[in-house]
């Protein structure tokens, strides 16, 4: 049909913190490159109906549905969603195309459904249909990658059975220790599933999709490294594949490698060897031990031996279920106001945990570092010297773990006072929790040295939000002190703070801070 306009339908995804997304359904700033939704003419429909490709949106995401119309003259439009008409304000872009937008802020279930856009141009009328649904992330999974040997080739395939299909990459590093951190220049990434270069120092495979990123390191024993004090330990669940690489370098080819499990040679088909000459003409040999699906009886000491290197072993432990081992008893710390301090949790876990640190209902990212002894450690230093309750939470596929910490900051008390017709109260959050004294100021005692002991009630209360203790002291008013100035003082090992209160004065009570 000659009269049909050229139209383009696009989806714009906005980043969650995108302040450019306005409330209007006209034209917010574009924060991501638009995704073409096709907009094909719908066959066998009465009237001219274009249908955009289905749109799947994450819960709470913000999007814009946009139509670009290349038709002469003015256009008018109307959005319809669930039988309700919505305002529509077309405008024209620099190429003189009509632009109609619908902004959906923070997607919810109620905003999912069919959005119909009716457009009337000078030449013709037509309808555009958008179907918007919430992405079912409940069906999403991200599984840790595992290795398989490529059939008839000396190569490893990296597999991650995840939904949606993940991007798989190998992360390779040829130097030792700290320089193999993710963003180091020594690290090389290869976005492919098959790896042929298996001689590197550190080999990991990572899989990533919408749920994040999971990595698996190729467990390696390097016979050229001095034997460690702690035997490396590898945990696996029943049914998972086992891969251990033994690597050795020698001045010539006159050496061989062997694997043994509990001093019995591994069966043929459970190992394969590769060798190469390095740049300085030394010989590198690697020998893989592998079991495609482990059972309980695959537990034990796997020893790699060479005629030219000290033997080394790893303890492989096959478990039925994942675990997190750590002490969950709560821990209390008290530190000075400027003292450097970090919370830390030491744990042994399989599979690797996901974790968070929480303080005052706010979550903080959690980093974990492997130690030489098979344990891992997570530290949290970003407490900014705020006293209260800090929570470490960890979980993996099979286990959960929570540990509580209390942080107290040693400081001199600071006093706040309030008074009513019948009593005066003072509050302080210093630490250690302060003790209280009340004094009466009179002609006889202008320096307020006359101590009040009658009618005083002290208590400590937990300020729930931070898990922080506040101490308070209340003085019940008696005839003997009405009309006098009284002084409440809070003191601890770091100092004293006082407030002076005029009792029974009309109007708001004046408080005089007196440190």
């Amino acid at each position: 049909n000659q009269d049909l306009p050229v139209i383009k339908c696009v989806l714009i995804n906005h980043k969650n913190n995108d302040s450019s997304v306005g409330k209007s359904s006209s034209y917010p700033m574009v924060s991501e490159s638009p995704e073409d939704l096709g907009c094909a003419l719908r066959p066998q429909s009465s009237g001219t109906v274009y249908e955009a490709a289905a749109v799947e949106v994450d819960v709470s995401a913000s999007i814009t549905l946009q139509v670009l119309v290349d038709a002469p003259g003015n256009i008018s439009c109307l959005w319809v969603f669930k039988h309700s008409s919505l305002n529509c304000q077309p405008h024209f872009d620099l190429q003189n195309r009509g632009v109609v937008s619908m902004v959906i802020l923070k997607m919810t279930e109620t905003q999912a459904g069919e959005y119909l856009l009716f457009i009337q141009s000078e030449a013709t009328n037509y309808t555009i249909l958008f179907t918007v649904s919430i992405r079912n992330t409940l069906l999403y999974t991200l599984r840790r990658p595992y290795f398989r040997k490529m059939e008839n080739q000396d190569a490893l395939v990296c597999i991650s059975e995840s939904v949606p299909e993940p991007i798989v990459e190998w992360v390779l590093c040829d130097s030792q220790g700290e320089s193999c951190k993710e963003e180091s220049p020594a690290v090389v990434k290869k976005e492919e599933k098959v790896l042929h270069e298996l001689f590197g120092t550190d080999i990991r495979c990572c899989a990533r999709n919408e749920l994040g990123r999971e990595c698996t390191r190729l467990f390696t024993i390097d016979l050229n490294q001095t034997p460690q004090t702690t035997l490396p330990q590898l945990f696996l669940k029943v049914g998972e594949p086992l891969w251990i690489r033994c690597k050795a370098v020698h001045v010539n080819h006159g050496f061989g490698l062997t694997w043994e499990l509990e001093n019995k040679a591994l069966e043929e088909g459970n190992y394969f060897e590769m060798s190469t000459y390095s740049t300085n003409r030394t010989m590198i040999r690697i020998l893989f031990a592998f079991v495609s699906s482990v059972a309980r009886n695959d537990t034990g000491y796997y020893t790699c031996s060479s005629s030219k290197h000290p033997s080394q072993s790893a303890l492989v432990t096959i478990v039925e279920k994942g675990f997190i081992n750590a002490t969950n008893s709560s821990e209390d710390y008290e530190i000075d106001q400027y003292e450097e301090f970090c919370f830390s949790v030491r744990f042994k876990a399989y599979p690797q945990i996901r974790c968070t640190w929480t303080f005052s209902r706010k979550s903080f990212p959690c980093e974990q570092k492997g130690l030489d002894n098979g344990y891992s450690i997570s530290k949290f230093c970003n407490h900014k010297h705020q006293p209260g309750e800090y929570i470490f939470h960890a979980e993996n596929d099979d286990a959960q773990f929570t540990k509580m910490f209390t942080l107290n900051i040693r400081r001199k008390p600071q006093v706040l006072a309030e008074a009513s017709a019948s009593q005066a109260s003072c509050f302080s959050d210093g630490y250690p929790l302060p003790s209280w004294t009340w004094k009466k100021c009179s002609d006889k005692s202008p320096n307020c040295t006359e101590e009040i002991t009658e009618g005083v009630w002290n208590r400590k209360a937990n300020r729930k939000v931070f898990g922080q203790w506040v101490s308070s002291s209340t003085l019940n008013m008696s005839e003997a002190i009405k009309g006098f100035l009284v002084k409440c003082c809070a003191y601890n090992s770091l100092g004293t703070s006082c407030e002076t209160i005029l009792l029974n004065s009309p109007g708001p009570f004046p408080f005089i801070q007196d440190n």
Partner: nanobody
């Protein structure tokens, strides 16, 4: 349960010799390799020597040519012969089979 017991440590003058023994029980001794480690005060534990099941021996660079490791499978014992001892050899010496460690024996080299 595997148990390892070291003996033979003591005080010796620089240039002197000592022979350490490591007796094992609860393990079929002949089927495993044995390592000697040492730990000087304030230092990490460090590997010293290894004897494999087949009798091959390996040494840390710091002791090569001075120490000799041997084994007697009939007695379930491994030996560390230490010659030309230096003050820096002062440490507690431990033997290890896989994850199992002995209690250690003190060697002090001092004039």
């Amino acid at each position: 349960q595997v148990q390892l017991q070291e003996s033979g440590g003591g005080l010796v003058q620089p240039g002197g010799s000592l022979r350490l023994s490591c007796a094992a029980s609860g393990v079929t001794f002949s089927i495993s390799y044995i390592d000697w480690y040492r730990q000087a005060p304030g230092n990490e534990r460090e590997w010293v020597a290894q004897i494999t099941r087949g009798g091959d021996s390996f040494y840390a660079d710091s002791v090569k040519g001075r120490f000799a490791i041997s084994r007697d499978n009939a007695k379930n014992t491994v030996y560390l012969q230490m010659n030309s001892l230096k003050p820096e050899d002062t440490a507690v010496y431990y033997c290890r089979i896989l994850s199992y460690w002995g209690q250690g024996t003190q060697v002090t080299v001092s004039s």
